[in-house]
Interface confidence: low
């Protein structure tokens, strides 16, 4: 599997990430265009160095590093600020770090991130694949101090990594505000009082709490003074505080919409309730399919069709206008055998799509909601055999199990009765003779007879051909609502 | 559930409500074949007679239960022998499997859940005033890698590797009281897949402080076992 | 989880102009596609522009020549200059955006996001 690294080495020359801005802010032009300016390296005089798109590269291993021809006419070619990768040594928290450690700090060989053991664990390579949880290296994919790894020792899950600091200086991490936006990891305000009006102890300082959000482990996260910092993912920019029963507490910064945003704010809002109808079956080919599945044979998500990641492809609802690629949903605009797409795997180029052929007398338009009911003991079943006790059996069996004719359930002759008439019971389909089990006999389906000395008896109604229902497989699709 | 939202009726066939044999609903379970349910250990600990539970299957509504709901005792109970929070209730006489009940699956021995997988939890439970309240309801929540759930601000070492951890850090949504035993669900591939047994939480629903499930995986041997020999 | 919030709708006159733009919130790590769609009563929601992480962008061909779609990848905006407005442009126009986002503890967890949308009216 190739890690599309965002970072460069030594001069660039290998570089394969996907800048397309030079460092003044300019948009590269194309390498394969020749507007506004014919260039000197194309895909077709250099195809091995990876020009691709618009994206900076090092074809002439120009010492500067990556660089690209610019959209700008008075600007033929610019240099591009890509990260240095952080192979030997790390910035910051080691986020990036790419290097191959594999031992922690107290020597320990670290374990493989794609192994189980000794120590089973949530960090599945295939399921972060911008992680680069590669082999058994120390890696920091979830805010730790620094990068860490599962250990090979089974008493010791896992451990921090000694990983030199890099001298040069850590890459921007883009635009920093003085107001609160988003969750506040780049506010770089003054602010230094909590929302209950405590002041905020410094970072540097262990009283009145002691704690590991210093400025030495988060050198990136500016964490000056005492000013209100969100260096580690919560909800907003918060601080310790100088009152030792409040260890820490969220701050309220004003937003940069104007409009303050207190803390309760700050949880994201659900989108709009837009619930697509499932189409689960295709005809022919599939050609025609216009549903909303999104997920292949083996479970994987599928790459929206505008979306150039993980997988380069000329499918685009620009190249194909009908064939209505919407989204990440399921389509066939290529005359394949059945609806496919790209997948989010960036090991897997594309696969078919977890759909079946619709059946001949299903609708290709689906009205929601697009539940399959199937027979059982509620569902009235029209055909002549019954499920479970055949409360809801609704066939033409008219005699009972000894051959005699049931009485009608509207009339009185020869039995008077009075509980079970169409009037009583108008749901359980007291119609003319039919066998019936309006009160859920354990015996089954009934009905007064024809003969005047037996007032009932019961009718002989095989029991239907069980239907198979797989494990874990809904008839009814869950409504799936977002947690928050 | 705290959050989350009502479920579409029957879109759970799986989900079990376990009940006194008055008819009180007290626990969740999970309906993982014709003759078997999945809930928790402590959702027995009133009584270790069968006849003092009953299961209601293919239920939607929690009081005024439908027509084609099957109410059926339970026979034997089988408590996790290494006192864990899982337990095995066998029922009285199998289940009628149709579209409105169905088993979830097992997941295979030791399969470990990846962290940030959304899964599914189910239940009639406390609501805490979210809405839905004596209706099945059902949330999405991410699950949480044991490492991350074990630090200090969130629950601090407290979470076994016969654990796992589920929801959202902000807070809001989560499963509660009387959702204790009822299932987590996961879906692979082209099936939900039972990972979870709703068992603990440091209250409901409040930031840092993700519900716990017992990782249903690290006990299919055991289940199949119990199943195979009973 | 990830927000888009759109601007920048209201009503002009036919042949007009308005230029709407959709920021994205949240803890995000990184955005491949951004794409506008439109819906108008009564009908499906349609594709009207998408432009990628690299800048390719791709148009319905109702609005090709008249709408163009642009990104500014350092602030997490898209925007839509719509020029020669029609009457049969008149829509809900939303913004929806798939990449990874980083939720609390920094796993990455992928998202596609929609906006709540803005409204654009043509007046013939």
């Known amino acids: 599997k190739v890690y599309l690294s965002e970072c460069k080495t030594g001069n660039g020359k290998n570089y394969r990430g996907t800048m397309s801005k030079t460092k003044n802010g300019i948009t590269c032009q194309k390498w394969s265009s020749t507007s506004p300016h014919r260039p000197r390296f194309s895909p077709a005089t250099h195809p091995s160095e990876g020009l691709e798109e618009n994206y900076c590269r090092n074809p002439d291993n120009d010492p500067q590093g990556p660089w690209c021809y610019t959209t700008d006419p008075e600007k033929r070619y610019d240099y591009c600020d890509i990260l240095e990768c952080e192979e030997e040594c790390m910035h910051c928290s080691g986020e990036n770090y790419d290097g191959k450690i594999s031992k922690t700090m107290s020597g320990l060989e670290c374990q493989a991130w794609d192994s189980q053991s000794p120590h089973a664990h949530g960090y599945i390579p295939s399921k972060f694949p911008n992680k680069n949880l590669k082999k058994n290296y120390c890696r920091n994919p979830d805010r730790e101090l620094r990068p860490w790894c599962f250990t090979t020792d089974p008493n010791k899950r896992w451990e921090l990594c000694d990983i030199p600091r890099c001298t040069t200086p850590p890459p921007s991490s883009g635009p920093t505000y003085q107001c609160l936006k988003g969750t506040g990891e780049n506010y770089r305000g003054n602010v230094a009082v909590t929302v209950s009006g405590h002041t905020c102890q410094h970072w540097s300082a262990q009283t009145p709490h002691t704690h590991n959000r210093t400025p030495e482990n988060f050198p990136c996260k500016n964490l000056d003074e005492n000013y209100c910092r969100n260096p580690d993912g919560k909800r907003a920019p918060w601080c310790h505080t100088t009152n030792s029963q409040v260890r820490w507490e969220y701050c309220k910064i004003p937003s940069c919409d104007s409009s303050p945003v207190s803390t309760e704010q700050l949880a994201p809002t659900a989108p709009p309730e837009l619930t697509p109808v499932v189409q689960d079956c295709y005809h022919g080919d599939g050609q025609s399919y216009r549903g909303t599945s999104s997920t292949t044979t083996t479970g994987k998500k599928c790459q929206s069709w505008s979306s150039m990641t993980p997988h380069r492809h000329q499918k685009t609802p620009e190249n194909y206008p009908n064939a209505g690629l919407t989204m990440n949903y399921c389509r066939n605009p290529d005359a394949d055998k059945g609806p496919w797409c790209f997948t989010t795997d960036p090991s897997v180029r594309w696969e078919y799509c977890n759909l079946k052929k619709c059946s001949g007398t299903e609708a290709s338009v689906v009205a929601p909601p697009p539940v399959v009911l199937l027979p059982d003991v509620e569902t009235p079943s029209e055909e002549d055999c019954m499920f479970g006790n055949g409360k809801g059996y609704r066939g033409k069996r008219a005699t009972t199990v000894t051959g005699t004719p049931c009485q009608d359930w509207a009339a009185q002759e020869p039995h008077r009765h009075s509980i079970f008439t169409p009037e009583t019971n108008p749901r359980a389909g007291l119609e003319k003779n039919y066998c019936r089990n309006p009160d859920g006999d354990v015996g089954g389906p009934w009905c007064y007879t024809t003969n005047p000395r037996k007032l009932y008896d019961y009718c002989d109604v095989p029991q239907c051909a069980a239907p198979s229902f797989d494990c874990g497989k809904p008839q009814v699709e869950p409504k799936k609502c977002p947690g928050r | 559930v705290v959050g989350g939202c009502v479920a579409h009726p029957h879109s759970w066939p799986w989900q079990v409500s376990l009940r006194t044999r008055f008819g009180m609903h007290f626990c969740g379970g999970t309906l993982i074949s014709p003759e078997w349910v999945l809930t928790a250990a402590h959702c027995l600990e009133k009584s270790p007679r069968p006849s003092s539970y009953k299961v209601i299957l293919g239920a939607h509504q929690e009081v005024n239960l439908e027509p084609h709901v099957q109410e059926i005792e339970v026979s034997r109970l089988f408590l996790e022998p290494t006192r864990k929070d899982i337990a095995l209730l066998k029922l009285s006489s199998p289940a009628v499997i149709t579209d409105k009940v169905i088993p979830a699956c097992l997941p295979s021995p030791n399969y470990v859940v990846a962290d940030r997988t959304e899964c599914f939890i189910t239940g009639w439970g406390e609501t805490q005033g979210t809405f839905g309240a004596g209706l099945l309801k059902e949330a999405q929540l991410p699950v949480i890698e044991n490492k991350v759930c074990n630090r200090y601000e969130f629950l601090n070492g407290r979470v076994q590797s016969t654990e796992l951890c589920a929801g959202h850090l902000a807070g809001g949504t989560d499963s509660c009281q009387g959702d204790s035993g009822g299932p987590l669900v996961c879906f692979e591939k082209d099936k939900y897949i039972l990972q979870g047994v709703t068992s603990w939480g440091l209250g409901c629903a409040r930031p840092n402080k993700p519900g716990v499930y017992v990782r249903v995986s690290r006990f299919v041997t055991w289940i199949e076992g119990v199943m195979r020999n009973n | 989880q990830v927000q888009l919030v759109e601007t920048g709708g209201g009503l002009v006159q036919a042949g007009g102009s308005l230029r709407l733009s959709c920021a994205a919130s949240?803890?995000?790590?990184?955005?491949?596609?951004m794409d506008w769609y439109r819906q108008a009563p009564g009908k499906e929601r349609e594709l009207v522009a998408a432009?990628?992480?690299?800048?390719?962008?791709n148009y319905a061909d109702s609005v090709k020549g008249r709408f163009t779609i642009s990104r500014d990848n350092a602030k997490d905006t898209v925007y839509l200059q719509m020029n020669s407005l029609k009457p049969e442009d008149a829509a809900f126009y939303y913004c929806?955006?798939?990449?990874?986002?980083?939720?609390?503890?920094?796993?990455?967890?992928?998202?596609?996001?929609w906006g709540q949308g803005t409204q654009v009216t043509v007046s013939s």
């Open positions: 929806n955006a798939d990449g990874y986002y980083s939720d609390y503890d920094k796993n990455l967890a992928e998202f596609n996001s």
């Open positions: 949240g803890n995000i790590f990184s955005i491949n596609a």
């Open positions: 432009i990628t992480s690299g800048g390719t962008t």
